[in-house]
Amino acid sequence: EEELQVIQPDKSVLVAAGETATLRCTATSLIPVGPIQWFRGAGPGRELIYNQKEGHFPRVTTVSDLTKRNNMDFSIRIGNITPADAGTYYCVKFRKGSPDDVEFKSGAGTELSVRAKPSAPVVSGPAARATPQHTVSFTCESHGFSPRDITLKWFKNGNELSDFQTNVDPVGESVSYSIHSTAKVVLTREDVHSQVICEVAHVTLQGDPLRGTANLSETIRVPPTLEVTQQPVRAENQVNVTCQVRKFYPQRLQLTWLENGNVSRTETASTVTENKDGTYNWMSWLLVNVSAHRDDVKLTCQVEHDGQPAVSKSHDLKVSAHPKEQGSNTAAENTGSNERNIY
């Protein structure tokens, strides 16, 4: 009778992560008597996957009933496959011996490759806010996928971006891979409602890409424009001066009124109105008692927005002349609080 051969018919098997891998193995003879063991790898570092004779292998089930005397099918199923299971599996026949069984024949091996889905892309923006016209970087990361081939695209409000750089690691073969991409985005004043999207396509996703998003509202700072206006006289000795703070984002804003350089009142923006583009407007007013002043009064509206250096706008209130509506429609310059724009 011809000597027993161990046949592993599949040179390679490709399985999706989470699924069950079937590793086929048959023997050509019932003789010699002895168990089958499955190993990953060979040599001194090989890993025992299944032992027909003894042991507990919760992820492994046999395809046929190995207790039947005439059984020659030693195929196994390994459940809940992960990328870490990739490798070459050997079906090894042992000959019954005393005290120990002796290795008798090995199959040629089956390469198990694992297809694993990428994790949901995580998009992160810069640590600090930036103002319009500045270029900011966004990163996108996804992990744990296999095989290595993957496609990543960037979008801003549905428009595909072209200025980005992508790396897949590691460079060589691995059980699973990670992708890291950095995109550059130029901010505009209209970007409060904008979104940046990172889209990842992989063979395991069956044409339904994964997306990660970042809202530019968390990245952008739109500095305010200031306008100080003197309103008509309410009473003979009172003047109402307003400071219009327009088109700012985010809402965090503190306004200080100064009369001739001395702090008159400080308040925090609360009841703001929202513009269509997501920016905010706010107005503060100051009632000035003209009779309390002998000389002309210099009123300054000083605004500190989102922790940035203060910007200010000044208005000269003529005490000698009869107060009439006056002011400026010129936008305030972004000057430090120690410099004043006098109109």
């Epitope: 001194p44 570092g45 002796v102 024949k105 060589g172």
Partner: antibody, heavy 123, light 107 residues
Framework: QIQLVQSGPELKKPGETVKISCKAS????????MSWVKQAPGKGLKWMVW????????TYADDFQGRFAFSLETSASTSYLQINNLRNEDTATYFC????????????????WGQGTLVTVSA | DIVMTQSQKFMSTTIGDRVIITCKAS??????VAWYQQKPGQSPKLLIY???NRFTGVPDRFTGSGSGTDFTLTISNMQSEDLADYFC?????????FGSGTKLEIK
Amino acid sequence: QIQLVQSGPELKKPGETVKISCKASGYTFTTYGMSWVKQAPGKGLKWMVWINTYSGVPTYADDFQGRFAFSLETSASTSYLQINNLRNEDTATYFCARDPHYYGTSPAWFAYWGQGTLVTVSA
Amino acid sequence: DIVMTQSQKFMSTTIGDRVIITCKASQIVGIAVAWYQQKPGQSPKLLIYSASNRFTGVPDRFTGSGSGTDFTLTISNMQSEDLADYFCQQYSTYPFTFGSGTKLEIK
């Protein structure tokens, strides 16, 4: 097809250093481990080291610890063997040989071999 | 270290002969044995692994057998291109060791 191409022959003096290379092609370098094997003229084969090309970690035979350094340049799919402070008994052909396993955790038999690099040490 | 002994340093053969090359391990190595063929000026070529598995592309006149400590490589129908050195190797335990080789010559 799978190829391991080694650098050319070297003639060195005792005490010098030699560095030879083995460039792999036809497969993904870091999927399979790499060994180095020594063969002195007219003699048998002696296994020196196995390198896990994915992690870069080597496993040495006792006789080849110390003066022998093994390294990888994965981006160039190349393995290197450096011998310091050369001795006459280092005169041999050095072969690189590839593992059979896909993600093997250890070496076993040597499925593919480089053509060999003859290192001659002579005063 | 495990010593792999190839007792025949040289073997004289005739074309068409059945040639049996033996290798004995100093301790049990299971079936963790490979056989290589090496021709002058060339690198070794893998013939057999796991004691009896023929490597891809190896002619079926080459057969490996044995387990435990005693192993054989059989060439069933000796050809002129088979004139070479033959080495066994164990990979059961570090360090991996080779036999000293058996050289086939024509009578």
